[in-house]
Amino acid sequence: EAHKSEIAHRYNDLGEQHFKGLVLIAFSQYLQKCSYDEHAKLVQEVTDFAKTCVADESAANCDKSLHTLFGDKLCAIPNLRENYGELADCCTKQEPERNECFLQHKDDNPSLPPFERPEAEAMCTSFKENPTTFMGHYLHEVARRHPYFYAPELLYYAEQYNEILTQCCAEADKESCLTPKLDGVKEKALVSSVRQRMKCSSMQKFGERAFKAWAVARLSQTFPNADFAEITKLATDLTKVNKECCHGDLLECADDRAELAKYMCENQATISSKLQTCCDKPLLKKAHCLSEVEHDTMPADLPAIAADFVEDQEVCKNYAEAKDVFLGTFLYEYSRRHPDYSVSLLLRLAKKYEATLEKCCAEANPPACYGTVLAEFQPLVEEPKNLVKTNCDLYEKLGEYGFQNAILVRYTQKAPQVSTPTLVEAARNLGRVGTKCCTLPEDQRLPCVEDYLSAILNRVCLLHEKTPVSEHVTKCCSGSLVERRPCFSALTVDETYVPKEFKAETFTFHSDICTLPEKEKQIKKQTALAELVKHKPKATAEQLKTVMDDFAQFLDTCCKAADKDTCFSTEGPNLVTRCKDALA
């Protein structure tokens, strides 16, 4: 229904706290360099204005669209061109082009320092002094580093953060209470960020139809007892919510997500028997819980998929009559039978089925042609199954750090032109799949591994798009989203690459490495490993292991030495020489 004042409508629906949080996220995601104080001032002005519209919807400018109101605010910021360069040109455009322009200038890899967590005492002090400002800072810092973070979900993580601080700041040992809990939230939030970015990429590159197909598969796996009409309704609503968030319409997105959660909880009987626990929770927790609710029990009496989609004489007629609906029912029926498959795999199977019908339905005897389609799925299913087995075996053998290193070597060989920091970040993220997925029960491994890898590789593609350097990466990133992971997996050593010359300074280390946290030490060592591979792309695993073991031993020795500086300056050159010899 149309409202006289959109801003008043959203303020009323969301309430002041969520309204302010979402506006702060929106501004922080658009203008990623502005300080918290600058954004907080704008948020307060927008909120005050919203309140005047709530009081009188006919007041001046209250009928303007949210894009117009927010865009005007952003464009009024002083020194916009000095701070943001050509983004300022967006302000010469009219809506909706202006908003599109802002979206195009979102930076997936902004040059901001890593978000450092203050030490426990300091954190608790500033939290107690002003919890609202503290949480505002959190929203601002996360949103500007992750310009596509799913806004209502970020409010959920802020709420989690708040609860942890409230609990731990009352403890005697704040540090040991806070650290594991906040690490857990951070890990989940980072995964949420790459997953949402993947959804926005799907929407931006391939449109709503592609996202809706993803949603149908995912929802059918989770709610196998819901009928196709119900799944279609949920997928349509979910597509709208995600389109809004990806498009920067965060107030609408959060409002519609709340509506969807309400609908699901009111219609549990036709959706799933597993929703009640989620539905008992308050809004943010409820929506989060519903987004990762466990799969409902599959109906026991599902007929074989072949009956309707291979053996039926009407296949081509049904396909001709409504292609999208017929393919949608295929995806629904296949997905509800296979919670053990990844969404990416299910979409590849649906694509294969569509291609088969396109070819076979044009033949004189279609049934004879498409009769073998399910058998043709087998290699598509085996490939990711083998990937999971091979990688989980390797993870179990090497542990997370060793597994990351194995992936780093593999990916540096595939795309040695990619910058070392990007390769290290990608390998570290890809390597976490082991800890995240390989410990799960067998039937949950494949969906966990492949859908997580796809999201990480989407980030690799986004970073590579900014500065394309590898034809291998460009090739894999240009295809459809669901083909990316198999494409990357199939890449081998890039034969066109001219190895980097050996530079001693790349492998020269100083005593400051000894005081670094373990994570930073690992990154230093992994940086060296990537550089070694760039120098010798065809080095054997054995050669690389020798060098890395030597390197670890060198660090251990010098960091334990009484005179660390002397040890690094005398033993360092010896290490470099041994490395060169080992790789010769």
């Epitope: 004489q313 009407e314 296949v315 081509c316 007629k317 396909y319 001709a320 009559e321 396109e358 339905c361 044009a362 033949e363 004189a364 005897n365 279609p366 049934p367």
Partner: nanobody, 115 residues
Framework: KVQLVESGGGLVQPGNSLRLSCAAS????????MSWVRQAPGKGPEWVSS????????LYADSVKGRFTISRDNSKNTLYLQMNSLRPEDTAVYYC????????SSQGTLVTVSS
């Protein structure tokens, strides 16, 4: 909405010819193989002939081979069945279908072969 409308049927004497047409709409005609199916009074449907989307490939039931010719004009979204040397046992309602379907989703056109 898919629509198939057959025409060209009628009463003919044995040995004579008829040409049936099927006008198609509501789908990408050239992307689909098409068939002619017939149903004699009191009997089940019987497949007669099929043609690929491009028209390059055709199939016939043994009972009509050498007498009937299936063809199509994709620019006109129309399927044809040229029936020569008609026999009394060819009497039936003829209807066109998409792909390998035998089920009837149109009125069909009645062909009666009788002296």
């Amino acid at each position: 909405k898919v629509q198939l409308v057959e025409s060209g049927g009628g009463l003919v004497q044995p040995g004579n010819s008829l040409r049936l047409s099927c006008a198609a709409s509501g789908f990408t005609f050239g992307s689909f193989g098409m068939s002619w199916v017939r149903q004699a009074p009191g009997k089940g449907p019987e497949w007669v002939s099929s043609i690929s989307g491009s028209g390059s490939d055709t199939l016939y039931a043994d009972s009509v081979k050498g007498r009937f010719t299936i063809s199509r004009d994709n620019s006109k979204n129309t399927l044809y069945l040229q029936m020569n040397s008609l026999r009394p046992e060819d009497t039936a309602v003829y209807y066109c279908t998409i792909g390998g379907s035998l089920s009837r989703s149109s009125q069909g056109t009645l062909v009666t072969v009788s002296s």
